[in-house]
Interface confidence: medium
Amino acid sequence: YSTSHPCFVSRPCLNGGTCHMLSRDTYECTCQVGFTGKECQWTDACLSHPCANGSTCTTVANQFSCKCLTGFTGQKCETDVNECDIPGHCQHGGTCLNLPGSYQCQCPQGFTGQYCDSLYVPCAPSPCVNGGTCRQTGDFTFECNCLPGFEGSTCERNIDDCPNHRCQNGGVCVDGVNTYNCRCPPQWTGQFCTEDVDECLLQPNACQNGGTCANRNGGYGCVCVNGWSGDDCSE
């Protein structure tokens, strides 16, 4: 049926659009960039991204239409809605602060919440983190008693235990919570890298050709026999 199909008879796709046969008498146009509509008859007015503030653009009869996100208005959604123009958003004497696309209440002392509609209780919920205990010190003030290893006005900061570390023999201090660990070089072990690693036990074949392994602090040596020499009696 191809020769009698609308794609060939009426060439419906305009402005360089490509016609695709869907069935005996239906079709679909793939438009060139810059054109839109069932038959590519409209200029794509959305091509220039006219819609602002995250709004959605659609083209209708060569015109663009913007669907604004909440908090914006105008033909191009370019205007921020000033929610603070409408009284009553913030309760208990809260000050309304207009923001792009929204608003925020700055509450007077003693109130909290999005609309300043809740009474502020310093320790409910507790602002103290990392297991800190909240203690109310006044009508609107609190103090956090931190667990060992933490500090900060809300116990948010880990105390670095490394400044006074006792890692020996080139060990590197790694801070923990109210403690630290020593990352030891290969020749040393133990909590503070003070214990010598016995390489002769770890590597039974450290010395070649009948050489005897002798452990030493921070290393080992080979006692070679039968004319062999070198670090591992291989020469």
């Epitope: 602002p127 003030t141 103090e143 956090c144 500090e151 900060g152 006005s153 809300t154 948010e156 900061r157 880990n158 105390i159 670095d160 801070d175």
Partner: antibody, heavy 120, light 107 residues
Framework: EVQLVESGGGLVQPGGSLKLSCAVS????????MEWVRQASGKGLEWVAA??????????VYSASVKDRFTISRDDSKSTLYLQMNSLKTEDTAVYYC???????????WGQGTLVTVSS | DIQMTQSPSSVSASVGDRVTITCQTS??????LAWYQQKPGKSPKLLIY???RLQDGVPSRFSGSGSGTDYTLTISSLQPEDFATYYC?????????FGGGTKVEIK
Amino acid sequence: EVQLVESGGGLVQPGGSLKLSCAVSGFTFSDFYMEWVRQASGKGLEWVAAQRNKANDFSIVYSASVKDRFTISRDDSKSTLYLQMNSLKTEDTAVYYCSRDGGRWGLDAWGQGTLVTVSS
Amino acid sequence: DIQMTQSPSSVSASVGDRVTITCQTSEDIYSGLAWYQQKPGKSPKLLIYGASRLQDGVPSRFSGSGSGTDYTLTISSLQPEDFATYYCQQGFKYPLTFGGGTKVEIK
């Protein structure tokens, strides 16, 4: 409204001294950790020193680059934070900001900054 | 000291673009991370604290995520007023350390 206003910056010769002030208002000064942060021209931010709050005995921490040369202090009666800078070096040239540590891993209020230039 | 590696150092973008900035720390900071915006001649402004919590008054197009040693700041739809330099900062332990900054420029 929380406000921090620094002052005391200026031109000083290497080896010289300068004392910066930061007057605060709009919050209970003694409840908060206070920090000094600096920024050399065209460079990033560098933490300098901190003074903990009253609950933590106003104890002090310094960065390695200023330890033994700079002293942070505060006067609660004047709601003012200070940074005494001695033995100044050319690499101390920067805008110095005082900031309030909000207690949630962020510095939530900053002053406008004061410029310190160390040059001969 | 905890090292902060921020990338990219600069990014060119257009209004409406989605912009992502990353920050990597040399050790686990347990979400103790903040993001700041700074415009030329101005002091830094706190955007995000605790890795993902939006500071009061900051538009919701800014968001933060991450844990452990890897953190991200996302601007979902870049606005003209967002062209600035952004810094990450760890507040998990002293000394406080900052990333090197990311300059967001107009394409």
